[in-house]
Amino acid sequence: HPSPAPPDQLNTSSAESELWEPGERLPVRLTNGSSSCSGTVEVRLEASWEPACGALWDSRAAEAVCRALGCGGAEAASQLAPPTPELPPPPAAGNTSVAANATLAGAPALLCSGAEWRLCEVVEHACRSDGRRARVTCAENRALRLVDGGGACAGRVEMLEHGEWGSVCDDTWDLEDAHVVCRQLGCGWAVQALPGLHFTPGRGPIHRDQVNCSGAEAYLWDCPGLPGQHYCGHKEDAGAVCSEHQSWRLTGGADRCEGQVEVHFRGVWNTVCDSEWYPSEAKVLCQSLGCGTAVERPKGLPHSLSGRMYYSCNGEELTLSNCSWRFNNSNLCSQSLAARVLCSASRSLHNLSTPEVPASVQTVTIESSVTVKIENKESRELMLL
């Protein structure tokens, strides 16, 4: 199967909604619950999510929602909102009509002729919006995550089943399987499907083996496969890297701790705009790369790679992806150059002058055997002990 094409939207940001919403087969999600398989039912209406009407909520709809979200069936009907709607009484005869307001503010309903998501449809303005909201608790709490990959969109694949997080065996694990994971998590498309030991091995059960997705499934548990077998160990835990994952490198410097800042995002390496490349952004990057702190931000060169990323950090973030970011935003990046940084752990600092020890210094570790004292963040003058 060919990789799916990247989404059309080039101008995206950390503040925007996911590329793929959780309930692709049925435009529904559960919010404000104890897990992804319980809570208030919301349906998607064009660009927004609206709470579903409780007055028309029934066991068929509840069952369909739980199945569509990969959460098993619905729990007993007693767990659902009672059928009697908490609505004001009908207006007295002769009262002025409120129909226009009621319709404009009307709540959507999820109406199902059976307990299967294909038999459901969302009907707009089906209820007055002052009524009770639909809620459901599903029988089986299923979830998916990527762990130990430096972000939510890369790492070892783990499924939550029967209350326990467990791995997926890498036998037959390929890009189609990883596509399903990435799409389900709202992480775009799969850049890599990785075999065991690319990420730290998991613990606990192995929930799946011989996974064989077509790539079109909305949920990993919809893919053909076998229950995890005993002969599959954690050294074979499957992993994935998705297009929305960001990883960074410094290029063109003396070592990996100096150079032009580049971010791998949506399958390619991109440069970073220096229009807001301040000490706080440089600090976050150096620390996340294990390169100490930022010493200097040299003047950059014109952008040479395909995309441009812009970051705005407060300096306390663990990685740049935790900062506010924008991708291919021409307004922010039009006059920019490609950001560069020199981190304190770079060996290019070793060849510089060694003045007397300043009175006030900051100590950082470069390598296990070398300690560096830095007088000033913007200075290259230091003392090697």
Epitope: A55, L56, A93, G94, S97, V98, A102, V123, R128
Partner: nanobody, 123 residues
């Protein structure tokens, strides 16, 4: 109190058409979502079609989708059900219903029921 009076029922051959009407006494007819239920001899009452306050949203039972059309004229306080391609299994008493809180898809939200009009589909 809303009075609902159905009309338009009768005998029709399979494949034929009928148009049911439901006239409402209430001046605030447009404050109610409306719908049709039916009950065949010896069977339970079942949902047929519903329409919201101003007619912007409709919903149909799978068994009538593509054959029946629900509509309303708020200026005339009247609800309609256009029934085409009628089948023997459509034979039933058809009830007009009104609901203030939600489209009358489930019986528990219905505030008012009409007396019903009989539709017989037979050759």
């Amino acid at each position: 109190q809303v009075q609902l009076v159905e009309s338009g029922g009768g005998l029709v051959q399979p494949g034929g058409s009928l148009r049911l009407s439901c006239s409402a006494s209430e001046r605030t007819f447009s404050d109610y979502a409306m719908g049709w239920f039916r009950q065949a001899p010896g069977k339970e009452r079942e949902f047929v079609a519903a329409i919201n306050w101003v007619g912007g949203s409709t919903y149909y039972a799978d068994s009538v989708k593509g054959r029946f059309t629900i509509s309303r004229d708020n200026s005339k306080n009247t609800l309609y059900l256009q029934m085409n391609s009628l089948r023997a299994e459509d034979t039933a008493v058809y009830y007009c219903v009104a609901s203030w809180g939600a489209m009358p898809v489930l019986t528990h939200v219905i505030n008012y029921w009409g007396q019903g009009t009989l539709v017989t589909v037979s050759s």
